[in-house]
């Protein structure tokens, strides 16, 4: 009978092992080992045993010891099991962005490693074990599906192999793949809310606000705002799970008409969009035309109000008849019309919304000069030594200059408080003069002496 020791060996790949072959008889006719492995007999051996060193063991092998004794020939095998850790442990790339609520499939590939019966593959989130499976196939592929929540954002996923040779080898061999960081996102199914003017006047500034709630992670969200071909530059305010993008928009005459306002919120590999129609319009203030802005009294004046062809105007609160963009009326200029305002208001309907503009013009009426009895009485009688204020008002446009002189030299102090003396008595010639001419009027001052009382 032939014996072999050790009957089983677990050794690292490429390693060496000493194997003892012995025969049951004292003087075997022959004793040896049959193996494809490189072997070296370690001398000296014994009468009935030999020691061999097997080197560079690359794979499992069963070297065979044989002996030929007088009672017969026999053999015995030793079982060499080679162990080695995998050459490649790799977690398949994760999607760049993973939607929250959708399952994520983790896939790990393991190349090499033996003995496979002792090789386990684990999928990990951080250090938490998600799945543990045997390595089957070459390369071995292990998958598991996990639900994804917001708390998985930024989590590291990896794959680890364990080669457990205990109790034969008092060691656990571990290989871990490079970790992959998961980026999760949550973009609600609701489109962004867009608040903007429905109508916008050329060369004026409007404000557009686009907001969306329920975003995660909100800091990664991007907003795109555009009006027609014009990209807007919004200021973005971030809330807990919300964002609000505010932009100013100024439109030019080239953009007149209907434009699409677009707000897009991009997160992960998804986009939510809202479109709104904005009508760009041009609406100059109406024109108020007077045949002449400055006329002499008695002149006929045509006041005309004209606006945008689609507008409806009102002139001094009176609608055009029929309603439309033009209104006019005729007046004979009187002094009372001097400084009179003519207001033209225009209403334009733009996409159902009413916009308003107005314009005012003033009429100047040239008249006078005038000296009336009412404003410049022809006779004053005042007691001597009393306090009096001579009044004489000249009217006209332009405003006339007024002088009241006695004997061509002595002035009457118009509008000033004076003590009445005998010198004040007499007839004064009041003269009102403007660029339009002059008028005169006699004013007599009588002074009552105390002796006549």
């Amino acid at each position: 009978q032939t014996s072999v020791f050790p009957p089983e060996v677990i050794l690292p790949r490429g390693g060496s092992v000493k194997v003892n072959c012995s025969a049951s008889c004292d003087q075997p006719i022959s004793l040896g080992m049959e193996t494809p492995l490189p072997k070296k007999e370690i001398l000296p051996g014994g009468n009935n045993w030999k020691m061999y060193e097997l080197s560079n063991v690359q794979e499992d092998s069963q070297p065979m010891c044989y002996s030929n004794c007088p009672d017969g020939q026999s053999s015995a095998k030793t079982l060499l099991t080679v162990y080695w850790t995998p050459e490649r442990v790799e977690l398949a790339p994760l999607p760049p962005w993973q939607p929250v609520g959708k399952n994520l499939t983790l896939r790990c590939q393991v190349e090499g490693g033996a003995p496979r019966a002792n090789l386990t593959v684990m999928l990990l989130r951080g250090e938490k074990e998600l799945s543990r499976q045997s390595a089957v196939g070459e390369p071995a592929e292990v998958t598991t599906t996990v639900p994804v929540g917001r708390d998985d954002h930024g989590a590291n996923f990896s794959c680890r192999t364990e080669l457990d040779l205990r109790p034969y080898v008092l060691k656990l061999f571990e290989n871990t793949s490079a970790p992959h960081q998961l980026q999760t996102f949550d973009l609600p199914a609701t489109p962004p809310q867009l608040v903007s003017p429905q109508v916008l006047e050329v060369d004026t500034q409007g404000t557009v606000v686009c907001s969306l709630d329920g975003l995660f992670p909100v800091s990664e969200a991007q907003v795109s705002l555009a009006l027609g071909d014009q990209k807007l530059n919004p200021t973005i305010t971030y809330g807990n799970n919300s964002l609000s993008a505010k932009a100013s928009v100024k439109v030019t005459a080239e953009e007149e008409g209907t434009q699409q306002l677009l707000c897009g919120v991009m997160l992960g590999n998804q986009t939510q969009e809202t479109r709104q129609t904005v009508t760009i319009y041009s609406f100059p203030a109406p024109n108020v035309n007077l045949t002449k802005p400055e006329v002499s009294e008695g002149t006929e004046v045509i006041v005309e109000c004209e606006a945008h062809p689609r507008a409806k105007v009102m002139l001094n609160g009176v609608p055009a008849q029929p309603p439309g963009p033009r209104a006019q009326f005729l007046l004979k200029a009187t002094p009372e019309d001097n400084g009179r305002s003519f207001s033209c208001s225009a209403t334009l309907e733009v996409a159902g919304q009413l916009v308003h503009k107005n314009q005012t013009r003033e009429l100047r009426v040239l008249y006078g000069p005038r000296l009336d009895e009412k404003d410049c009485p022809g006779n004053w009688t005042w007691p001597e030594n009393s306090q009096q204020t001579p009044m004489c008002q000249a009217w006209g446009n332009p405003l006339p200059q007024l002088k009241c002189l006695k004997d061509g030299t002595f002035p009457l102090p118009i509008g000033q408080s004076v003590t009445v003396t005998r010198d004040l008595e007499g007839t004064y010639l009041c003269q009102a003069r403007s660029t339009r001419g002059e008028v005169t009027r006699e004013v007599t001052v009588n002074v009552l002496s105390p002796r006549y009382e």
């Epitope: 429905q198 109508v199 129609t277 689609r310 409806k312 105007v313 009102m314 002139l315 001094n316 609160g317 009176v318 609608p319 029929p322 309603p323 207001s343 033209c344 208001s345 209403t347 309907e349 996409a351 159902g352 919304q353 009413l354 308003h356 107005n358």
Partner: antibody, heavy 123, light 110 residues
Framework: QSVEESGGRLVTPGTPLTLTCTVS????????MSWVRQAPGKGLEWIGI??????TYYASWAKGRFTISKTSSTTVDLKITSPTTEDTATYFC???????????????????WGPGTLVTVSA | AYDMTQTPASVEVAVGGTVTIKCQAS??????LSWFHQKPGQPPKRLIY???TLASGVSSRFKGSGSGTQFTLTISGVESADAATYYC????????????FGGGTEVVVK
């Protein structure tokens, strides 16, 4: 000045129906006209408007379901393209245009209403 | 769009009492607001226009106030004939997709 609706009747779902609004004492070339409806026991619901020049605007829910058109200087039509039981209501026509002489501006105001016409949609 | 929110939806008032109905616009409508009331089987009747101007033939017990986004209709010395549903209406816009009327307030007179 008056407004009167006509054409309301019982129709089966999907059968188009046209209502007519006839005005007197003023011309549709000077005024905007709105259509408003009221389902039994419910509030007033603006359907749409037609301008003096014939432009039309509709409530979002009414777009594609109703068509407003001017057929003469005194009549405006409202077509219910494919009525459903939800369209059962009294339909009113109202003059919807006014002006403020103090500001000189025009504005929308339903100052003149018709008595309404009842539309019943039932299978 | 100019959303019109009317409160309360329903109110009970005793004869001789005062009732206040509020209407809020989502954006400024200046003073372009009208108030209507409607009785069963009748078309709406305009009571107030331009926020505070009384329509002809309407009792001075009806008073409208407000501008911009907040408006109020006050009925003082309530009479049994005032029992009706009251609506506010914005006169600023009739754009596509517009909201024109408030939801209505039912006034019940005890």
């Amino acid at each position: 000045q008056s407004v009167e609706e006509s054409g309301g009747r019982l129709v089966t779902p999907g059968t188009p129906l046209t209502l007519t609004c006839t005005v007197s004492g003023f011309s549709l070339s000077d005024y905007y006209m709105s259509w408003v409806r009221q389902a039994p026991g419910k509030g007033l619901e603006w359907i749409g408007i037609i301008s003096d020049s014939g432009s039309t605007y509709y409530a979002s829910w009414a777009k594609g379901r109703f068509t407003i058109s001017k057929t003469s200087s005194t009549t405006v039509d409202l077509k219910i393209t494919s009525p459903t039981t939800e369209d059962t209501a009294t339909y009113f026509c109202a003059r919807d245009w006014s002006y403020d002489s103090s500001s000189g501006y025009y504005y929308y105001d339903m100052d003149l209403w018709g008595p309404g016409t009842l539309v019943t949609v039932s299978a | 769009a100019y959303d019109m929110t009317q409160t309360p939806a329903s109110v009970e008032v005793a004869v001789g009492g005062t009732v206040t109905i509020k209407c809020q616009a989502s954006q400024s409508i200046n003073s372009w607001l009208s108030w209507f009331h409607q009785k069963p089987g009748q078309p709406p009747k305009r009571l107030i226009y331009k926020a505070s101007t009384l329509a002809s033939g309407v009792s001075s017990r009806f008073k409208g106030s407000g501008s911009g986004t907040q408006f109020t209709l006050t009925i003082s010395g309530v009479e049994s004939a005032d029992a009706a549903t009251y609506y506010c209406q914005q006169g600023y816009s009739r754009s596509d997709g517009e909201h024109v009327f408030g939801g209505g307030t039912e006034v019940v007179v005890k």
